[in-house]
Interface confidence: medium
Amino acid sequence: SERCDDWGLDTMRQIQVFEDEPARIKCPLFEHFLKFNYSTAHSAGLTLIWYWTRQDRDLEEPINFRLPENRISKEKDVLWFRPTLLNDTGNYTCMLRNTTYCSKVAFPLEVVQKDSCFNSPMKLPVHKLYIEYGIQRITCPNVDGYFPSSVKPTITWYMGCYKIQNFNNVIPEGMNLSFLIAFISNNGNYTCVVTYPENGRTFHLTRTLTVKVVGSPKNAVPPVIHSPNDHVVYEKEPGEELLIPCTVYFSFLMDSRNEVWWTIDGKKPDDIPIDVTINESISHSRTEDETRTQILSIKKVTSEDLKRSYVCHARSAKGEVAKAATVKQKVPAPRYTVELACGFGAT
């Protein structure tokens, strides 16, 4: 056959769908690879062809669109399963072609089983809610296009295995689940089950997402440097190891980049001709506030190093702060026989 622009296997679009539920999968060509949409392609005389490779097989085969009740069908640039079966798992290819043009892309489709509590190997999207921040909502995801607006589905929400019917601060509002005030106890997996009729049959769509309650922007503060501070003096003798921790607390801020760095005499440690290492550790609170610690280490400090200025810097979307460490050369303890004797006038 003639040459075809092959975009390969698009593993970025690892599509997972539940067994025995409808699934509508758009050909990724128009979404991510080509600069025109399906309508333009269709009106230009291009044809969209679907085929697949079963799991653990190498053989490409056409998709059977003549199954009972049109279980698999194609509509424009969408491949429909009504519903899916476990053995639909495989790599699917959509190819756009005419006599002079050809472009194709493959993508993996995994049909996943779930248990009665909605547990499954499905990768779950995470929705972050601010703690104690007034009314916030999550919306049942990826249900657009499954039924026309004239159809009124029934939506049931679950937290874990339990139907949400005992409203503490969580209220089902159709496709939305409203959190009047979000608390740590609202962390968990939330599932919406959308039930709708189609051609005398009843279909269910199950969508699960993870809710993570995070620090509220109204409580957010600029970075706080806990160490170094004014109460600790780093007194060392030449030849000893110098260890200075820079410990910074960052309030959770959505999409904020938290940064911690040291300067030595106003320069980055890499720009100073001394043997310095910096080790970083990060910990998070239950509401995703972050504590970063960067330990500056000089194995064998010199008297020159003990005269330098060591400053810890921190930056977030809330602001930038800096704190200098107090570093001193340890004054050797006086030796009684010589120094003190001299002091008393001995010869």
Epitope: N166, N168, N169, E173, S178, L180, F183, I184
Partner: antibody
Framework: EVQVVESGGGLVKPGGSLRLSCAAS????????MSWVRQAPGKGLEWVGR??????????DYAAPVKGRFTISRDDSKNTLYLQMNSLKTEDTAVYYC?????????WGQGALVTVSS | QSVLTQPPSASGTPGQRVTISCSGN????????VNWFQQLPGTAPKLLIY???QRPSGVPDRFSGSKSGTSASLAISGLQSEDEADYYC???????????FGGGTKLTVL
């Protein structure tokens, strides 16, 4: 099926004490916020107070007329909510309802009648 | 005197549409969701409408709620004799740090 059943109502003298219990079933009681609402004879509904789940701090809020005299507590191991009423006044005479939720009261018990009279 | 204000009574004939109002302020209805309860004679109250216009399962769609600013209303269309009951609105109140109820509206089906 969600059920809440109040018990412990009765006749008590002014200044006396009484403890109401509310047995809950059919939902995860430990995760639920619970409230008490009362209704004086021939009058409207009046919120008494609520208790949050332990995971949300287990804290309580009370209506001004009962603050300092009434205490709401819970025993998650027994799926039971309590209302301890001290220094009772004649105006506390009412049917006391136990309800699920802290904002939206979706399930109600049948109520326990408390009569404060000398 | 209740924090939320409701008319003490309302009436209508079978099949009619009746509306019950509930008036509050910025610290309750203006800021929080409104709930409506129905109390049939001699029974415990029952949740009818919550959060603007959501109905628990089993509540007919003849009942609907709406909210505008610091006021809310409950509408009952296609009035039936079994709708004869007391209706209460409720909302959380920030300034009082508690739930406040309306005084209740007695609905009579003529």
């Amino acid at each position: 099926e969600v059920q809440v059943v109040e018990s412990g109502g009765g006749l008590v003298k002014p200044g006396g004490s009484l403890r109401l219990s509310c047995a809950a079933s059919g939902f995860i009681f430990s995760k639920a916020w619970m409230s008490w609402v009362r209704q004086a004879p021939g009058k409207g509904l009046e919120w008494v107070g609520r208790i949050k789940s332990k995971t949300d701090g287990g804290t309580t809020d009370y209506a001004a007329p009962v603050k300092g005299r009434f205490t709401i507590s819970r025993d998650d191991s027994k799926n039971t909510l309590y209302l301890q009423m001290n220094s009772l006044k004649t105006e506390d005479t009412a049917v006391y309802y136990c309800t699920t939720g802290g904002y939206v009261f979706d399930y109600w018990g049948q109520g326990a009648l408390v009569t404060v009279s000398s | 005197q209740s924090v939320l204000t409701q008319p003490p009574s309302a009436s209508g004939t079978p099949g009619q549409r009746v509306t019950i109002s509930c008036s509050g302020n910025n610290s309750n209805i203006g800021s929080y969701i409104v709930n409506w309860f129905q109390q049939l004679p001699g029974t415990a109250p029952k949740l009818l409408i919550y959060s603007k216009n959501q109905r628990p399962s089993g509540v007919p769609d003849r009942f609907s709620g709406s909210k505008s600013g610091t006021s809310a209303s409950l509408a009952i269309s296609g009035l039936q004799s079994e709708d004869e009951a007391d209706y209460y609105c409720a909302a959380w109140d920030d300034s009082l740090n508690g739930v406040v109820f309306g005084g209740g509206t007695k609905l009579t089906v003529l």
